[in-house]
Structures are given as structure tokens and as C-alpha cells.
Interface confidence: low
């Protein structure tokens, strides 16, 4: 069985059930896709497209589904057991150090560098120095000479919100 969803994972209004509520059908926990009833006796299903729970839990409320931001595409919808999977639109990517927004991929590499990696929803284009082969990505000085690139094909989600 999966680990319990912890208090920190919950929005303020989604408080975990107090200990005395742990008397639902399966060792005090409800299965994924459900939350515990207020009297702790029953498991209540989450509402498709509105909320979800991914683990065995004693939540009084299911977790609210993420809505994809503008600039993101919905890779898979929210179900009762899985949150929405959002992905950056073609030509944009999400960096690990700034996961809150999708950033535009560069259109080409600076002078003296060649492109070795396409723009993907989770990475900018990759450039290496022609001579040394040293990789370079992230912020660069103003591009003086560009090599046109086409966005890569999305292969996996760059964000699994929730």
C-alpha cells in the first residue's frame, strides 16, 4: 500500500481526519479515489474531474484537481485516482528551478556553438561549443547568430502538479 498523504500535502481546508475517525472499512483508511466520511464509518468516492486521492488515506476531503495554466496543455485529465498532468506547450519548457511557469525555448545557439538537443517540454535546446564539446544551456548572451530549430516532440510530462 502507498504511503499516507501527509498533512503538508493538503490545502488548508483539506485537513486530515483526527485519529478517532480511523474506523473505515480497511484498517481505518480509504482506497485511492475516495476519502473518509465525517463519522469515519464509510469511504466516499471523489468527484471525477473535480477532486482525487492517489493513496490509501484518511482525508476528510479529496484533493482538488489541478487546472492547467495558459501556456500548458492537458496531457491527461484528472481522474478520481490521479491528478491532472499538465505539460508546457510546444516551444516552451519548465525548468526545475522555476517550475511555476513555462519559459520560451531559445530559437538557436550563440555564435561558436552548435545545437545538440531539441526544445522539449522539460528542457531548453542544448548547445555545445564547436571546439570543446562543452554543453551550454539556460540564459545566454544576446544571440548574434542563430541556428533555427524545431520544437521536440513531447514524450513525457514536465509537471505532475498536486
Amino acid at each position: 500500500e502507498s504511503a499516507l498523504i501527509t498533512q503538508q500535502d493538503l490545502a488548508p481546508q483539506q485537513r486530515a481526519a483526527p485519529q478517532q475517525k480511523r474506523s473505515s472499512p480497511s484498517e481505518g483508511l480509504c482506497p485511492p479515489g475516495h476519502h473518509i466520511s465525517e463519522d469515519g464509518r464509510d469511504c466516499i468516492s471523489c468527484k471525477y474531474g473535480q477532486d482525487y486521492s492517489t493513496h490509501w488515506n484518511d482525508l476528510l476531503f479529496c484533493l482538488r484537481c489541478t487546472r492547467c495554466d495558459s501556456g500548458e496543455v492537458e496531457l491527461s485529465p484528472c481522474t478520481t485516482t490521479r491528478n491532472t498532468v499538465c505539460q508546457c506547450e510546444e516551444g516552451t519548457f519548465r525548468e526545475e528551478d522555476s517550475p511555476e511557469m513555462c519559459r520560451k525555448c531559445r530559437t538557436g545557439c550563440p555564435r561558436g556553438m552548435v545545437k545538440v538537443g531539441d526544445c522539449t517540454p522539460w528542457s531548453d535546446i542544448e548547445c555545445v561549443h564547436k571546439e570543446s564539446g562543452t554543453k551550454h544551456s539556460g540564459e545566454v548572451p544576446a544571440v548574434e547568430e542563430t541556428v533555427t530549430s524545431s520544437p521536440g516532440t513531447p514524450a513525457s510530462p514536465c509537471s505532475l502538479s498536486g
Partner: antibody, heavy 120, light 112 residues
């Protein structure tokens, strides 16, 4: 047309196990539906046994049947299975698989039913 | 578990009659989202059950409008305005959204 085709009748001895199948067709098996199993003893009402969520294999069981049954799926053949262990005469019944929409808890499609008879 | 009590267990009718079946839950079955997951199924002799009504009053596709569901909280009713031969069988109420989902004992609709 959405259909749930179940395996044929079973005659088994007390203490034995039985595994019955339910083949789904007419819809995407791994879409957002639960595959439930329901027991109907002769001339009696219906009892929910449990469900399996084909998309990720999640299961939930009625406490009464926990440890007695195991629900599995084979995604490649769009088939759900229910295995019953340590059978007694109390397990003689018709077993239905049913499709349940996971955002509205109704069973919109029912299987053909599998009769299990436990007798020595 | 929540107990679903159906009355009557047997309902003799003449064709063309109105029929009414009651289902009472041992506790409120209103979901925390405000919906009430109370469904009705009909099982004809030798057949699998079929869904008639979901969420108290919504007719499932293909179900004739002579079937109607009503109720709230703990008390629910299925009405058939004019019984025809194909309506004969056993009617079950069903409480969804809580684990374990529970069926009523059934009401047998039969000819007088």
C-alpha cells in the same frame, strides 16, 4: 456496443479455488471506469464484492470478501478476473462483473453472469 | 455498513396500474459534494440487472419516461406510471459513493 462477456459455469469442490473471467469490449478498457464484481446468491439480493481500476490496478474490497477473493486484470486482452479461494457452499451463486463510471457510482453495463456451484 | 430497506418485498399489480416502491437508508447518503448517489436497477427473470435511474431521479439512456425516481436524505421512491408486461421483475435500490456500495433486498413486481 459495450459488452462484458463472462466465462461459463463452474462446478467446484469445497475447499477448491475458482477463477472466473470478464472480457470487456466496445470501449477502452483502461478509460475511467471501475470493473466491479457483484454476487447474487440463489433467490437473494445483490452484494458488491469489490472493484478493480484497470487503468492502474487499484482494488477495493468489501470487508466481507477480503482475503477470500483476488481481483486482477490483463490489460492486453481487456479482461478482468476474480479468483475465489477456499470455496464453501455459501459461495454458490451467480457472479456478475459490472462497469462502474468512477465519477458517478452507477453500474451502467452488466456482464452475462457466471454460475458457480460448490458441491462435493 | 449502511442498510437499504425496500418496501414492499412483493408488489402484485395489474397491467396499466401505477406502482410505487420505497427505499429507506439507515443514514443519510448525501455525498459531501451535495449529490445523492441512489440508483434503481431492474432484474428480469433469467437476466442480468439493468440500470434504470441514477442519482435519485435521472433516467438512464433508453429507459421509458413511465419510470421516475424521487426522494432525498434517507427516503427514496421509484414510481412506474403505467405498468406494462416488460416491467415485471425484481427492482433493487442501490446506494453508491460509499464503500461498500449496498443494494436493497429487492421488490418483486408481479401480476395479481
Amino acid at each position: 456496443e459495450v459488452q462484458l462477456q463472462q466465462s461459463g459455469p463452474e462446478l467446484v469442490k469445497p475447499g477448491a479455488s475458482v477463477k472466473i473471467s470478464c472480457k470487456a469490449s466496445g470501449y477502452t478498457f483502461t478509460d475511467y471506469y471501475y470493473l466491479n464484481w457483484v454476487k447474487q446468491s440463489h433467490g437473494k439480493s445483490l452484494e458488491w464484492i469489490g472493484y478493480i481500476y484497470p487503468n492502474n490496478g487499484d482494488t477495493s474490497y468489501n470487508q466481507k470478501f477480503k482475503g477470500k477473493t483476488t481481483l486482477t486484470v490483463d490489460k492486453s486482452s481487456s479482461t478482468a478476473y476474480m479468483e475465489f479461494r477456499s470455496l464453501t457452499s455459501e459461495d454458490s451463486a451467480v457472479y456478475y462483473c459490472t462497469r462502474g463510471s468512477n465519477w458517478i457510482w452507477y453500474f451502467d453495463v452488466w456482464g452475462t453472469g457466471t454460475t458457480v456451484t460448490v458441491s462435493s | 455498513d449502511v442498510l437499504m430497506t425496500q418496501t414492499p418485498l412483493s408488489l402484485p399489480v395489474s397491467l396499466g396500474d401505477q406502482a410505487s416502491i420505497s427505499c429507506r437508508s439507515s443514514q443519510s447518503i448525501v455525498h459531501s459534494n451535495g449529490d445523492t448517489y441512489l440508483d434503481w436497477y431492474l432484474q428480469k427473470p433469467g437476466q442480468s440487472p439493468k440500470l434504470l435511474i441514477y442519482k435519485v431521479s435521472n433516467r438512464f439512456s433508453g429507459v421509458p419516461d413511465r419510470f421516475s425516481g424521487s426522494g432525498s436524505g434517507t427516503d427514496f421512491t421509484l414510481k412506474i406510471s403505467r405498468v406494462v408486461a416488460e416491467d415485471l421483475g425484481v427492482y433493487y435500490c442501490f446506494r453508491g459513493s460509499h464503500i461498500p456500495p449496498t443494494f436493497g433486498a429487492g421488490t418483486k413486481l408481479e401480476l395479481k
